[in-house]
């Protein structure tokens, strides 16, 4: 059994999240993950899910009763999702921490928009996109 | 020339983001995107970047002078990043809109944590992970 399971069960108790009524009105993440089989699509969704959990854990970082559980799960997420690659985790953290209301950040984001857009399509830089994925313009 | 270019230039004027001083103290997104060549890594980062722009555009949705530009760019992002797939865009939007301070959302997130974690590794379900990437447990 992976180590996160025991710690996640501990968090369930803490958040009172073990009851069947929690599943009422559908799922947050599981239904969405079920929709996407391709690795790149899954990463788009998992990126948002992981950042949600990191934010959630941050809000409870001073709570001693769940600190060990949170640290174990975060470590496990770093191994599994970021492949233990701290540079990947650091870049991800930078992106999640930018404030959308900061004027300097806004200006920079708009300044970089054209180049960001140019890189958005899969294989936009390598020219390896399949014909079926090509965008044709008149 | 892609349609977003003209509209992004319009946004640059609006945000006063065309000056060279905007690039001071490094980039927000471009430096990070440069680090990641693998498609799945790029999607992890681009997912955060796209959600940032959507939040930014939401904050300016009532500003008539840039409404057309924002709409054009959002449409282009949908084509490029979500492959014009509305379901993908909708699932993404759902994830970005969950409130981390909502108690019901917190309980659901913790309730689903074990299953989310089980799916985090690349090819966790398919068993296609390379030997060098295997995780061994005592």
């Amino acid at each position: 059994q992976d180590p996160y399971v025991k710690e996640a069960e501990n968090l369930k108790k803490y958040f009172n999240a073990g009851h069947s009524d929690v599943a009422d009105n559908g799922t947050l993440f599981l239904g969405i993950l079920k929709n996407w089989k391709e690795e790149s699509d899954r990463k788009i969704m998992q990126s948002q899910i992981v950042s949600f959990y990191f934010k959630l854990f941050k809000n409870f970082k001073d709570d001693q009763s769940i600190q060990k559980s949170v640290e174990t799960i975060k470590e496990d997420m770093n191994v599994k999702f970021f492949n233990s690659n701290k540079k990947k985790r650091d870049d991800f953290e930078k992106l999640t921490n930018y404030s959308v209301t900061d004027l300097n950040v806004q200006r920079k984001a708009i300044h970089e928009l054209i180049q960001v857009m140019a890189e958005l399509s899969p294989a936009a830089k390598t020219g390896k996109r399949k014909r079926s994925q090509m965008l044709f313009r008149g | 020339q892609d349609p977003y270019v003209k509209e992004a230039e319009n946004l640059k004027k609006y945000f006063n983001a065309g000056h060279s001083d905007v690039a001071d103290n490094g980039t927000l997104f471009l430096g990070i995107l440069k680090n990641w060549k693998e498609e799945s890594d790029r999607k992890i980062m681009q997912s955060q970047i796209v959600s940032f722009y959507f939040k930014l555009f939401k904050n300016f949705k009532d500003d008539q002078s840039i409404q057309k530009s924002v709409e054009t760019i959002k449409e282009d992002m949908n084509v490029k990043f979500f492959n014009s797939n509305k379901k993908k865009r909708d699932d993404f939007e759902k994830l970005t809109n969950y409130s981390v301070t909502d108690l019901n959302v917190q309980r659901k997130a913790i309730h689903e944590l074990i299953q989310v974690m089980a799916e985090l590794s690349p090819a966790a379900k398919t068993g296609k992970r390379k030997r060098s990437q295997m995780l061994f447990r005592g």
């Epitope: 996160y4 640290e71 470590e75 496990d76 492949n83 701290k86 953290e93 | 990641w36 890594d41 060098s132």
Partner: antibody, heavy 124, light 111 residues
């Protein structure tokens, strides 16, 4: 002060097994990954294995996997490297090195703190 | 397979600047942090640069690190060379999931 102290090295015969240990102090041991790195006499550095902190995942060099096993006891602040079917080319100084705290985005640098090493000699 | 290639030896006069390169054979050098270690005879390796370009406390600013994606390599630059800098230098990075990789080492001689 962060300290890593290796022990258990010595002279063994080819084909024998040996377990070297590392005791750590001066930091919250269970939070940190621990690496084993070796250095043959007059040669460069070679990564051997890594074990994660609380999750105890094990990572091995492709060339050594199967013969070497890394483990840890967080209560005892200790990490172990069990080596079997030892060969002459396994003769080296074995270093215990502190890794990242992967539960903390502001973790201190990987491989910043090294022990002094324990010498393993494989010879008939 | 994955390799980090360093020159076997580098030399320079006191006060001068030397550069030690570390070329990654496959995968992008920019996708993983690079560290640099100094090892004097009889001592354990000591970090001089971490996470591409940062210096641990106590390391003088004569030591600097950089990464160049176009050549897929990292570099350690030592300026104002001193006799005490004479040592072996190793670069280090990663591949796969937490697989650690060391360069072969470079012997620095101060003439």
């Amino acid at each position: 002060e962060v300290q890593l102290v290796e022990s258990g090295g010595g002279l063994v015969k080819p084909g024998d097994s040996l377990t070297v240990s590392c005791v750590a102090s001066g930091f919250t041991f269970s939070n940190y990954f621990i690496h084993w790195v070796r250095q043959a006499p007059g040669k460069g550095l070679e990564w051997v294995a890594t074990i994660s902190g609380r999750t105890k995942y094990m990572f091995y060099s492709d060339s050594l996997r199967g013969r070497f096993t890394v483990s840890r006891d967080n209560a005892a602040n200790s990490v172990y490297l069990h080596m079997s079917s030892l060969r002459g080319e396994d003769t080296a100084l074995y270093y215990c090195v502190r890794g990242y705290d992967h539960s903390d985005s502001n973790s201190a640098a990987d491989l910043l703190h090294w022990g002094r090493g324990t010498l393993v000699t494989v010879s008939s | 397979n994955f390799m980090l290639t360093q020159p076997l030896s580098v030399s320079g006069y006191p006060g001068k600047t030397i550069v030690i390169s570390c070329v990654r054979s496959s995968g992008s050098v920019a996708s993983h942090y690079v560290q640099w270690f100094q090892q004097r005879p009889g001592s354990a390796p000591a970090m001089v640069i971490y996470e591409d370009s940062h210096r641990p406390s106590g390391i003088p600013d004569r030591f600097s690190g950089s990464v160049d994606a176009s050549s897929n390599s990292a570099s350690l630059t030592i300026s104002g060379l001193k006799t005490e800098d004479e040592a072996d230098y190793f670069c280090q990075s990663y591949y796969g999931n937490n697989q650690v990789l060391f360069g072969g080492g470079t012997k620095l001689t101060v003439l």
